[in-house]
Structures are given as structure tokens and as C-alpha cells.
């Protein structure tokens, strides 16, 4: 409405404060200076503006910063961050972990939105790698964050960052992701003693090769069945009955309940029935006595 484009007398905003909360949309547009808003962004969240009013404030910032907001403004966006589109965020250059934390806090309790995903992507790309502090922050807000990365993206995670990873952060990781993370974890925890090492490495073992599982079986680690069931099938198959018994310790009895599920099922099929019987668990399906087992894969490798 043409007559409403000028700010009414006495309504020009000198500060961003609660005197503005009942301004109509056009009054905010006409009476709030964008530069003033930018310098006082930290006040916006303390003022109960309606969502329409927030839209107006965003529009003002967009006009002031068509190439993207400076970090001094981004850090104080608060609820206004929820109004940003991924396209808006791609224009930003966020370098401070404090800024990242402030924006993640706004979205806390919600699933990772496209805005948050874009923000994290911009931040990590800007840093060049997922350092420990960043990973610590991201997994604190989004426990599944690590498992949302591709194996290629995970390759940029330095071993030192692995210390920030909690078991629950790996819950949704698939074997390809664990294949990348396991060697990093092995490197990160290499100076720990046996029992402490196992506690730390346990969550990553879904990426462990056969030789490492064999080594663990010599250390009385007592791996639980939940961890065993997440191991790579190809890594479990070459293990002997004696090695699995040592690896699981008292938990070996749990094999019976899992005998129809991979990798236990496939492992049983590779073992001599005689050897399985030594466990006294009633596991069936092993290779009958007197049968010769030819490892064709080994034969092919030699020829």
C-alpha cells in the first residue's frame, strides 16, 4: 500500500528492542534500518517477534548482504537461522566453531534439516578436514552424523578425531564406513594397553580384518555377541573354533541363539563338525568328518 511505505512519525527504530514487537509488517520494513539490525542481531532472539516479523528482518539482511551474511551476523541469527534456505547458507563463509555451535543449538532436538546439512558441509569444507573439536561438536548434536558421511568424506577424518567418537555415534554406520574408520581407530588407540584398547576399538570392529580378530583372540577380550554379530562375514569365516572361543570367552554360549544368522551361520558352515562339537553348544551344520575342504579362493590366488 503506497501510503504505508514511509515510516510514521516517531516510529523510526533507534534500537532493536521490544518496542518493535507490535509493529506491523510494513512498519518494520519502513522503520528498521538494516545496518542497525545487523549490528544488533544478538537482541532479536530476546524479543518475541512473530514469524512474519522475522521474515521481514531476514529480507532486510538479504538486501544488505546480497553476497551472503558476514560471520558477525551469522553467529547471532538464532531463530532466524530456521528461516534460511540452503541457497542462503551456501553464500556463507563460517569459520568459527562457536558460530557453528550457536546455530546447531537453534535446531537442537530436531532432525538434521537441509539447512543444517548445508551449514555443516560449508563449515567442514572451509576447514579442509573433520578435526576433533568439530567432530566432537557435530556428534554431540547429531549422534548419527558420522554415519551420514560417505566413505570418501570419512577418509578426511584424521585419526586424532576418533577420540571424540562414542559407540552410539557408529550405530547406523554400514560396513563400508567402518572399513574406513577402523584403521583410523586402530592407529588412534595403538598405544593403549590390551583391555583399554579393546574397550575403545570395540565399536569400530565391524571394519576389522581377520588377522586383527585373530590377534584379539589371544588377549582374553571376552567380546560380546552384539559386537561379534557386527563383524565382517569375510573376516569371521577364516577364524577357527578355538579362536572364536577365545575371542568370545564366556559369551561363546550365545552362538547357539545366533546359529541361523550371519556371520555365525556362514562361519558354522566352514567349520568341522568335530570342532564345533567341542564347544558343547549343539551347533549343527559343520563339515562332516572325513570330508576334505578345498579352499578354491586360495587356489585361484596361487595360480
Amino acid at each position: 500500500e503506497v501510503e504505508k511505505t514511509a515510516c510514521p512519525s516517531g516510529k523510526k527504530a533507534r534500537e532493536i528492542d521490544e518496542s518493535l514487537i507490535f509493529y506491523k509488517k510494513w512498519e518494520l520494513e519502513a522503520c528498521v534500518d538494516a545496518a542497525l539490525l545487523a549490528t544488533q542481531m544478538d537482541r532479536v532472539n530476546a524479543i518475541p517477534f512473530t514469524y512474519e516479523q522475522l521474515d521481514v528482518l531476514k529480507h532486510k539482511l538479504d538486501e544488505l548482504y546480497p553476497q551472503g551474511y558476514p560471520e558477525s551476523v551469522i553467529q547471532h541469527l538464532g531463530y532466524l537461522f530456521l528461516k534460511m534456505s540452503p541457497e542462503d547458507i551456501r553464500k556463507w563463509n563460517v569459520t568459527s566453531l562457536e558460530t557453528l555451535k550457536a546455530l546447531l543449538e537453534v535446531n537442537k532436538g530436531h532432525e538434521m534439516s537441509p539447512q543444517v546439512a548445508t551449514l555443516i558441509d560449508r563449515f567442514v569444507k572451509g576447514r579442509g578436514q573433520l578435526d576433533k573439536d568439530t567432530l566432537d561438536t557435530l556428534t554431540a548434536f547429531y549422534p548419527g552424523y558420522l554415519c551420514s558421511l560417505s566413505p570418501e568424506e570419512l577418509s578426511s577424518v584424521p585419526p586424532s578425531s576418533i577420540w571424540a567418537v562414542r559407540p552410539q555415534d557408529l550405530d547406523t554406520c554400514d560396513p563400508r564406513q567402518l572399513d574406513v574408520l577402523y584403521p583410523k581407530a586402530r592407529l588412534a588407540f595403538q598405544n593403549m594397553n590390551g583391555s583399554e584398547y579393546f574397550v575403545k576399538i570395540q565399536s569400530f570392529l565391524g571394519g576389522a580384518p581377520t588377522e586383527d580378530l585373530k590377534a584379539l583372540s589371544q588377549q582374553n577380550v571376552s567380546m560380546d555377541l552384539a559386537t561379534f554379530m557386527k563383524l565382517r562375514t569375510d573376516a569371521v569365516l577364516p577364524l577357527t573354533v578355538a579362536e572364536v572361543q577365545k575371542l568370545l570367552g564366556p559369551h561363546v554360549e550365545g552362538l547357539k541363539a545366533e546359529e541361523r544368522h550371519r556371520p555365525v551361520r556362514d562361519w558354522i558352515l566352514r567349520q568341522r563338525q568335530d570342532d564345533l562339537d567341542t564347544l558343547g553348544l549343539g551347533l549343527q551344520g559343520g563339515i562332516p568328518n572325513g570330508y576334505l575342504v578345498l579352499d578354491l579362493s586360495m587356489q585361484e590366488a596361487l595360480s
Epitope: 521490544e18 518496542s19 509488517k25 530476546a46 518475541p48 514469524y51 516479523q53
Partner: antibody, heavy 122, light 107 residues
């Protein structure tokens, strides 16, 4: 306990005045924007007036602008509505209501007074 | 100002029925719509905020959905205490506005 206790309604002649009060307890009164919502007999709800937590900013519906004044005394945890130049169409039950959040940007009411009837009639 | 229109203005239903009330805004209000229940002689009571979030203490038979301009309040299995008038309210912009109400009566 958390509550809003209203007083001050009654019968008044057209052109007359009345002051409604709303005493709050059980929450930090000064942190919350407060409103008056009215309901004419057999009709729906109308947001009449609102005031910010500090009292520094006020809102009035066009239907009452210039005649009603909202105010608050945070030291007494009390909200007021001064109604002047009353008309027959102002006859309604008036409710005071608390905005749900101290911060944030949601505007809905999670706590209401019981209401007080204002009748404007000669 | 944003106008909020409720339908129907009244409905008759029986205990156990599934009841649906709709609310339409004159422009898009995202998910900033709230629902209240009012019984005769009483103040309104908040049921649903932000279109679909159930207010603490409200029975789970009440649910809300919608975004943009069209919203719905559903009572999955009507109980005797649910016979009342229901109002929607938009909180996207000033002035806050209410629907005209839907009276749910006993069939």
C-alpha cells in the same frame, strides 16, 4: 500455583469507564507478554490488546484503539485494562491470557484467567 | 490481517466417533496455527500448538496436522468430555486472529 485471577467487570452505561485487573502468580510475570482476549455473548474470540514483558510496547485492535489502555505493574504482578468511552458492542467476557514462552517467537496462550463479564447497557 | 475460517461451524457426533475440524488461513502461515477447546462458562484451553504439537496434559486422542493454509484438528475417538467448542488461532502475524469456532454437540 500458576494462575491468573481476574476482577473488575460489571454493568456500565454507554460512554462510561471500567478498569479490569488480572493478578498473576506462580511464574515470573515480568518475563512474559500478556494479552486481553474478549468474547461477545454467543460469539468467537477476539484478541483485543497486548503488552510486552517490560510494558514498553503495546498493541490494540482497531475496534478499541484510542479508547482502551493496557498496562502492567510488574512489582505487583498485575495486568490492567482501562476501558473508556464504552459502547454496547464492547459487551463481552474479557479474559487475560499469558503468552506461552518468555523467549522464542510463538504467540499462543497457555494460561487464561477465568474471565470477567463487562456489560455495556443503558 | 490474516483471516482464519473454520468449518463446519457445528457438528453432531457420538461418543467413539472420529471427528475432524478444519481451519483455513487467508494466506500461508507455515505451521503457526494453534487449537483451543472451550467449554460453556469456561476459559479456552490450549490443545495443540504449532499445527501438530500436543500441549502437555492433553490426551493423545487429539492431534493436529497441516501447513501453509489448510489445517486439521482430529479427535480419534470422541469422549463425553470432548463436547465443546473448538477454536483455531494463527500466530504467524500480528494481529493474532481466531477462527469463528466449531461447536461439537452430542448426536
Amino acid at each position: 500455583q500458576v494462575q491468573l485471577v481476574q476482577s473488575g467487570g460489571g454493568l456500565v452505561q454507554p460512554g462510561g469507564s471500567l478498569r479490569l485487573s488480572c493478578a498473576a502468580s506462580g511464574f515470573t510475570f515480568s518475563s512474559y507478554a500478556m494479552s486481553w482476549v474478549r468474547q461477545a455473548p454467543g460469539k468467537g474470540l477476539e484478541w483485543v490488546s497486548a503488552i510486552s514483558g517490560s510494558g514498553g510496547s503495546t498493541y490494540y485492535a482497531d475496534s478499541v484503539k484510542g479508547r482502551f489502555t493496557i498496562s502492567r505493574d510488574n512489582s505487583k504482578n498485575t495486568l490492567y485494562l482501562q476501558m473508556n468511552s464504552l459502547r454496547a458492542e464492547d459487551t463481552a467476557v474479557y479474559y487475560c491470557a499469558k503468552r506461552e514462552a518468555a523467549a522464542g517467537h510463538d504467540w499462543y496462550f497457555d494460561l487464561w484467567g477465568r474471565g470477567t463479564l463487562v456489560t455495556v447497557s443503558s | 490481517d490474516i483471516r482464519v475460517t473454520q468449518s463446519p461451524s457445528s457438528l453432531s457426533a457420538s461418543v467413539g466417533d472420529r471427528v475432524t475440524i478444519t481451519c483455513r488461513a487467508s494466506q500461508s502461515i507455515s505451521s503457526y496455527l494453534n487449537w483451543y477447546q472451550q467449554k460453556p462458562g469456561k476459559a479456552p484451553k490450549l490443545l495443540i500448538y504449532a499445527a501438530s504439537s500436543l500441549q502437555s496434559g492433553v490426551p493423545s486422542r487429539f492431534s493436529g496436522s497441516g501447513s501453509g493454509t489448510d489445517f486439521t484438528l482430529t479427535i480419534s475417538s470422541l469422549q463425553p468430555e470432548d463436547f465443546a467448542t473448538y477454536y483455531c488461532q494463527q500466530s504467524y502475524s500480528i494481529p493474532l486472529t481466531f477462527g469463528q469456532g466449531t461447536k461439537v454437540e452430542i448426536k
